[in-house]
Interface confidence: low
């Protein structure tokens, strides 16, 4: 995850990243919108591998919790919003079928704008 | 991937998302910064699974290729930048060791700011 601060840059939205285990996650939403259970371990050729994910979300304690940094406030309302992406995970669906499915995880914090209507 | 446009919102940065196969990807960078080969298929209990990834990057054709949307240009220079996250993939390193490693993939397009110095 490239760090803009190192280049004297600021992010429009502050984010935090962490490693999340399947045990912490427990459930997730798959591509069809269904809730699935995320299995804690994945069988591999030499035993089992702990399943975990790198997640990034908006920092609720950050400066940008009220709105995005650097926005032209005369014309725009802004909000930092966590966005999601898909990663493959070993899961069990509601019918207890185990399989590899793409699940949604938090991967970024982006700024969304709505235009201010003339007062 | 929640679509801000549906809620009458605009993104500060325009992005494009696509499914990328390991065959298209060929290589990636792992967490230690080393280049690894991404294997096309993953062995699972009932055969093989094609390895692919959901990637999001800044739209090079979009309005925001010159800078971010909605920024207060009097005080800030801005740039839309593709950010990366880590996902687990079956890979082969330079010593031909096959294993599950976290690799970097493009997951978002965010806006970075640099403050304008007094003219």
């Amino acid at each position: 995850h490239s760090d803009p601060a190192r280049r004297g840059e600021l992010s429009v939205c502050d984010s935090i990243s962490e490693w999340v285990t399947a045990a912490d996650k427990k459930t997730a939403v798959d591509m069809s919108g269904g809730t699935v259970t995320v299995l804690e371990k994945v069988p591999v050729s030499k035993g089992q591998l702990k399943q975990y994910f790198y997640e990034t979300k908006c920092n609720p304690m950050g400066y940008t919790k009220e709105g995005c940094r650097g926005i032209d406030k005369r014309h725009w309302n802004s909000q930092c919003r966590t966005t999601q992406s898909y990663v493959r995970a070993l899961t069990m669906d509601s019918k207890k079928r185990i399989g590899w499915r793409f699940i949604r995880i938090d991967t970024s914090c982006v700024c969304t704008l709505t235009i201010k209507r003339g007062r | 991937h929640s679509d801000p446009a549906r809620r009458g919102e605009l993104s500060v940065c325009d992005s494009i998302s696509e499914w990328v196969t390991a065959a298209d990807k060929k290589t990636a960078v792992d967490m230690s910064g080393g280049t690894v080969t991404v294997l096309e298929k993953v062995p699972v209990s009932k055969g093989q699974l094609k390895q692919y990834f959901y990637e999001t990057k800044c739209n090079p054709m979009g309005y925001t290729k010159e800078g971010c949307r909605g920024i207060d240009k009097r005080h800030w220079n801005s740039q839309c930048r593709t950010t990366q996250s880590y996902v687990r993939a079956l890979t082969m390193d330079s010593k031909k060791r096959i294993g599950w490693r976290f690799i970097r993939i493009d997951t978002s397009c965010v806006c970075t700011l640099t403050i304008k110095r007094g003219r």
């Epitope: 427990k26 459930t27 259970t37 079928r97 | -």
Partner: antibody, heavy 121, light 107 residues
Amino acid sequence: DVQLVESGGGVVRPGESLRLSCAASGFTFSMYDMSWVRQAPGEGLEWVSGIRGSAGDAVTYYADSVKDRFTVSRDNSKNTPYLQIDSLRAEDTAVYYCAKENNRSIFFDYWGLGTLVTVSS
Amino acid sequence: EIVLTQSPGTLSLSPGERATLNCRASRSIGSSYLAWYQQKPGQAPRLLIYDASTRAAGIPARFSGSGSGTEFTLTISSLQSEDFAVYYCQQYDDWPSFGGGTKVEIK
């Protein structure tokens, strides 16, 4: 030994509500998913509802026929699953069984003796 | 919804005879996700077979299951007096559903 003992059945009028309980013992209750299956007099078995154990974050699931009126819940501290039935109808008259789901899938390796619910005006 | 049809509705046999119970699914059941239960009057159902052919713990070897796709069979090789009961099949490929049952009665 695994034991499941249902209670809470009885005679009720159409439109009323009822809450069934199932006292579970002999296994680590919180780890297992539980279901409710009913059997109308002289009829076959009908699965109505299930609830995940701790591994599944107590996700609930229902048969389409009862989705709007039945609510399944559980109290892991009391080793008890519950089935709340609202707006009871004559066709809900049945013996209601509490069943322990096998960890492999939604089939049932242990059953209670059932509790009879009779809906009559 | 997967509909299971059991046949025959009633099977009249003598102790020591072989019983063959059938269960047909309205569509193919993946990975043989089918179970069989026994139910005696006034009692709870008891799991006999799961995954179409695997005997549950404590179930005697005279009970066996077979089949795949849409056709499944429960066989009791030599009926004992305690085997006279109603037998249900259940699929768990989709949300669980049960067949209508086959009653095995003494001839």
